[in-house]
């Protein structure tokens, strides 16, 4: 019934609204810090800098279909996925080119959506049902945020007023996880 072949990574047919891409696993918050480790302090960063504009994170483009019950968007929408790693911007181009990636020694920085945009999409429905229009929220840009901890809970804080923007026009190489696999996971999430 409906778009039978349109399934998520659990191979179950999506029965409801399918708008939001799932955040990559490393972006899920609620990771609490064991206060016995590091004396409750964030781990040392080898490339500590006071200039927030030197920090950057990667924007990966992907396309996905939007679903609503049995209906699916006529065309896929293009959206950004914000990579979970943040590092000094000056290292990114060369390091990525060499296949190396600067990694902080702890989960203190996150690359997360900064701005969103709304896009209206036309949904096609099976069985002669009239097409539907939906307005979806899509990630428009990414930023670095620092993860601060208090009361043993995680919270994301802005890493500066104007968080560092990734360099435009560069196509970073995906990490060990292939872009295709990443797209498959994200494409059909809610």
């Amino acid at each position: 019934q409906g778009w039978q072949a349109f399934k998520n990574d659990a191979t179950e047919i999506i029965p409801e609204l399918g708008e939001y891409p799932e955040p990559p696993p490393e972006l899920e918050n609620n990771k609490t810090m064991n206060r016995a480790e590091n004396g409750g302090r964030p781990p040392h960063h080898p490339f500590e800098t006071k200039d927030v504009s030197e920090y950057s994170c990667r924007e990966l483009h992907f396309t996905r279909y939007v679903t609503d019950g049995p209906c699916r968007s006529a065309k896929p929408v293009t959206e950004l996925v914000c990579s979970g790693q943040c590092g000094p911007a000056r290292l990114l181009p060369n390091a990525i080119g060499r296949g190396k990636w600067w990694r902080p020694s702890g989960p203190d920085f996150r690359c997360i959506p900064d701005r969103y945009r709304a896009q209206r999409v036309q949904l096609l429905c099976p069985g002669g049902e009239a097409p539907r229009a939906r307005k979806v929220r899509l990630v428009a840009s990414c930023k670095c945020k620092r993860l601060t901890r208090f009361h043993n809970q995680s919270e994301l804080k802005d890493f500066g007023t104007e968080a560092a923007r990734p360099q435009k026009g560069r196509k970073p190489r995906p990490r060990a996880r292939s872009a295709k696999a990443n797209q498959a996971e994200l494409e059909n999430a809610y």
């Epitope: 955040p23 914000c82 997360i112 929220r137 809610y190």
Partner: antibody, heavy 116, light 111 residues
Framework: QVQLVESGGGLVQPGGSLRLSCAAS????????LSWVRQAPGKGLEWVSV???????YYADSVKGRFTISRDNSKNTLYLQMNSLRAEDTAVYYC??????????WGQGTLVTVSS | DIALTQPASVSGSPGQSITISCTGT?????????VSWYQQHPGKAPKLMIY???NRPSGVSNRFSGSKSGNTASLTISGLQAEDEADYYC???????????FGGGTKLTVL
């Protein structure tokens, strides 16, 4: 089916703290934006806060710096930590699922009373 | 601060049609952003009735319809029934897509 169940409301003194929970089921919790919306007795609805799938948080000016929204994706639970509570925070607090820029499912609400 | 303005109350007889308006600034109900409508019976949680100006969720009667002209959105209920008596709220989102605003609510009385 989608279900949202709030808990944690009660009577608290001004300046006190309270943590609300919202247990969710019936949908892919970690992929949705989730909000808290409140309603003071006899008054209208007021949006309080939202948390994105990435854990980024946004607040209404009236609660900024006092309330903290968070989520535990492993428990399918949304939280609202409320500190420095004031009499004007007295309300029924609803958690709501945000889909396609509107709230398509709401919990039944939990009453928070701030009074000495 | 952006605000959505609704009439405090409207009334109608069974079988009649009524319209509830929701007026705001161009940044919250103009061409950029869309409006949703919620119904709330006393002591109950709000229920989504209309979204994206004129879309009805499944299960909502086709007696409910929405429209928008300029910076005013409207909810029309045709063929009024006793169970339609409730409070109705319009809502929209901020330009950043990360905040929301509600109208003050309209009490609908079915005479």
């Amino acid at each position: 089916q989608v279900q949202l169940v709030e808990s944690g409301g009660g009577l608290v003194q001004p300046g006190g703290s309270l943590r609300l929970s919202c247990a969710a089921s019936g949908f892919t919790f970690r992929s949705h934006w989730l909000s808290w919306v409140r309603q003071a007795p006899g008054k209208g609805l007021e949006w309080v806060s939202v948390i994105t799938p990435y854990g980024d948080t946004y607040y209404a000016d009236s609660v900024k710096g006092r309330f903290t929204i968070s989520r535990d994706n492993s428990k399918n639970t949304l939280y609202l930590q409320m500190n420095s509570l004031r009499a004007e925070d007295t309300a029924v607090y609803y958690c709501a699922r945000d889909t396609y820029l509107h709230f398509d499912y709401w919990g039944q609400g939990t009453l928070v009373t701030v009074s000495s | 601060d952006i605000a959505l303005t609704q009439p405090a109350s409207v009334s109608g007889s069974p079988g009649q049609s009524i319209t509830i308006s929701c007026t705001g600034t161009s940044s919250d109900v103009g061409d950029i952003n869309d409006v949703s409508w919620y119904q709330q019976h006393p002591g109950k949680a709000p229920k989504l009735m209309i979204y994206d100006v004129n879309n009805r969720p499944s299960g909502v009667s086709n007696r409910f319809s929405g429209s928008k002209s300029g910076n005013t959105a409207s909810l029309t209920i045709s063929g009024l029934q006793a169970e339609d008596e409730a409070d109705y709220y319009c809502s929209s989102y901020g330009e950043s897509l990360t905040s929301y605003v509600f109208g003050g609510g309209t009490k609908l009385t079915v005479l």
